[in-house]
């Protein structure tokens, strides 16, 4: 769909990120502890038989669940899937983890616990030492570092081999700040909150995180329905009522990894005006290069035209004129009772020689394989390091 340019398709972001094929070096794999050098973190590669055949922690994972295996991807990635195995060791290994938790970080300082769409943290793991169990991560996580925390229901040895699947997060978006989404009351309640937001919520404002507006999932024409199974009405959208904003607009701020020249912002909006949802009447964006700097120049203003009577959801493109910034603040003007967004993405180019915001610890990432990048995605570039894994079918224990 041409009108979806700038949005990525998470279904195509499922490439092995380098544990099994060793493009992730040993130095980027670590752990809270190891039983021995032969079960050190570096032996945690999926399908590998190195050492004694897996990573095994020194301490018990029952009852505290404090031991972890850490993988540093060096750059932000969208991680959509993980795979786990136990310790095979030529048939001698009997240790595996029946369940585990994941935690992730974009900067190595703030750690978030992965939860599924219903708030469940615990992931079903392996039933034997050798089989690979894949877990589709819904929602996916934008992360540089990922930690696996094996679990047990009694004192026992557990061991892990892992792989991560996804693609490089090239959008550069580190966080967005927005008012908390609200509830619309129709014949049933329609919950328009950002249910996967991984930042903080204080005083009706969400900040410091990412959520449904950056997960690649675009909402349906009828906002009461969802792309996801077994979720509540309104799930795909984040929405705000005009009644709650005397200013007449919703203000959001976007923080990026480094200085970028912004060509456009793509906002996927609902326009089911028979139920009160309307495209924004206009958008006004301001730009600045640093957090404590003044907003630079005149704001970019864009009035929306087009067929506003068409009730179909659509992506609205807001030209940003190549303005250079690391922070954007955008105001979305109400043109009706409700604003409903399902996705916001940006078309931008990194400004040469701009250093990353997250410390000086990011090396340049090579393309995999070497050569020109694919051109069909602007938010995410895929890393075709191997065959795409086949995910478990929806409804299976690990899907």
């Amino acid at each position: 769909d041409a009108d979806m340019k700038g949005h990525f398709d998470p279904a195509k972001c499922r490439y092995a990120l380098g544990m099994q094929d060793r493009t992730i070096p040993d130095s980027d794999i670590s752990a809270s502890s190891s039983w021995s050098d032969s079960t050190a973190a570096r032996h945690s590669r999926l399908e590998s038989s190195d050492g004694d055949g897996a990573w095994c922690p020194a301490g018990s994972v029952f009852p505290k669940e404090e031991e972890y295996l850490q993988v540093d991807l060096q750059r932000l990635h969208l991680v959509a899937l993980v795979g786990t195995q136990g310790r095979h060791a030529g048939g001698l290994g009997k240790e595996f983890s029946r369940s585990y938790r994941l935690r992730y970080s974009r900067d190595g300082r703030r750690w978030m616990g992965w939860k599924d769409r219903w708030g469940q943290e615990v992931i079903s793991g392996n039933e034997d030492p050798e089989g690979v169990v894949l877990k589709d991560l819904g929602p996916p996580m934008v992360a540089r570092l990922v930690r696996f925390y094996p679990r047990a229901d009694r004192v026992m040895s557990v061991c892990l081999r892992v792989e991560l699947y996804g693609c490089l997060w090239r959008d550069g978006l580190l966080s967005y700040t927005a008012p908390v989404g609200q509830t619309m009351y129709l014949s049933e309640a329609v919950y328009l909150n950002d249910s996967t937001y991984d930042g903080h919520t204080v005083g009706g404002l969400q900040y410091g995180g990412l959520g449904q507006l950056a997960d690649g999932v675009v909402g349906l024409d009828d906002f009461r329905k969802s792309q996801e199974l077994r979720v509540w009405p309104g799930y795909d959208y984040v929405g705000w009522s005009n009644h709650s904003f005397s200013s007449g607009y919703v203000e959001m701020e976007f923080e990026f990894d480094r200085l970028r020249a912004f060509q456009a912002m793509q906002v996927h909006c609902n326009n089911m005006h028979t139920l009160g949802a309307r495209l924004p009447g206009g958008v006004e964006c301001r730009f600045r290069r640093g957090p404590a700097m003044a907003w630079e120049g005149e704001p970019m203003r864009h009035n929306l035209g087009g067929n506003l009577g068409d009730p179909r959801a659509r992506a609205v493109s807001v030209p940003l004129g190549g303005r250079v910034a690391r922070f954007l603040q955008c105001r979305f003007l109400f043109a009706g009772p409700w604003l409903l967004f399902s996705e916001i993405s940006f078309i931008s180019d990194v400004v040469n020689n701009s250093s990353p915001a997250l410390g000086g610890t990011f090396p340049p990432a090579p393309w995999w394989p070497p050569g020109p990048p694919p051109t069909n995605f602007s938010s995410l570039e895929l890393e075709p390091r191997g065959q795409q894994p086949v995910a478990k079918a929806e409804g299976s224990p690990t899907a």
Epitope: G108, R109, H200, E255, A292
Partner: antibody, heavy 120, light 110 residues
């Protein structure tokens, strides 16, 4: 507990490494920070090493200091000290166990400090 | 770069009295602020975190408030033992802010 060591008198330009030795908790689960205080002055944040091993520094400290760790120690290296680096250097532990979703860097366990004097 | 400005630099009050110390941030830091007490020859001691949460073992006479860019530490029923220098400190929450300390406020108890 947390205890700093390695503070001494050195001449300008001579690299100096301070060591923070910890006990009773694991560095794989807590962030550790270095803060300094010049005589009669206020507290000045230098940098931090997360449980992940990644390091972050105050803007003014980038390139002037490095932080590294082992399983029980955290080192601060002053790469090329000047007289302005004369201070008491404190090592402190972040209060949040990093598996909490509360992630602000507040420091509730401090060492007594070690005095560094840079003089020719 | 985030700057925390503490006022006043010094304040004097009688035993049983109340002192108020202000901390202003150069940008919005939401509630990511801590207060410390430091006595001569000692390391700092955490009093308040998250702008208003009392650290374990700290008397309830210490109260933190504020959010965004304006924060306050109030010490009521002042005791001689409260004589110290007090510092505010920003907590990290994203790449746009990092740790910084205010310049300090000396509290003298008469």
């Amino acid at each position: 507990s947390v205890e700093e060591s390695g503070g001494r008198l050195v001449t300008p330009g001579t690299p100096l490494t301070l060591t923070c030795t910890v006990s009773g908790f694991s560095l794989s689960r807590y962030a550790m920070t270095w803060v300094r205080q010049a005589p009669g002055k206020g507290l000045e944040w230098i940098g931090i090493i997360g449980s992940s091993g990644l390091t972050y520094f105050a803007t003014w400290a980038k390139g002037r200091f490095t932080i590294s760790k082992t399983s029980t120690t955290v080192d601060l290296k002053i790469t090329s000290p000047t007289t302005e680096d004369t201070a008491t250097y404190f090592c402190a532990r972040g209060m949040w166990y990093d598996d909490s979703d509360d992630y602000e860097d507040y420091f509730n366990l401090w060492g007594p400090g070690t005095l560094v004097t840079i003089s020719s | 770069e985030l700057v925390l400005t503490q006022t006043p630099a010094s304040v004097s009050a009688a035993v049983g009295g109340t002192v108020t110390i202000n901390c202003q941030a150069s940008q919005n830091i939401y509630s990511n602020l801590a207060w410390y007490q430091q006595k001569p020859g000692q390391p700092p001691k955490l009093l308040i975190y998250g702008a208003s949460n009392l650290e374990s073992g700290v008397p309830s006479r210490f109260k933190g408030s504020g959010s965004g860019t304006q924060f306050t530490l109030t010490i009521s029923d002042l005791e001689c033992d409260d004589a110290a220098t007090y510092y505010c400190q920003s907590g990290y929450y994203s790449s746009s802010t990092d740790i910084a300390f205010g310049g300090g406020t000396e509290v003298v108890v008469k």
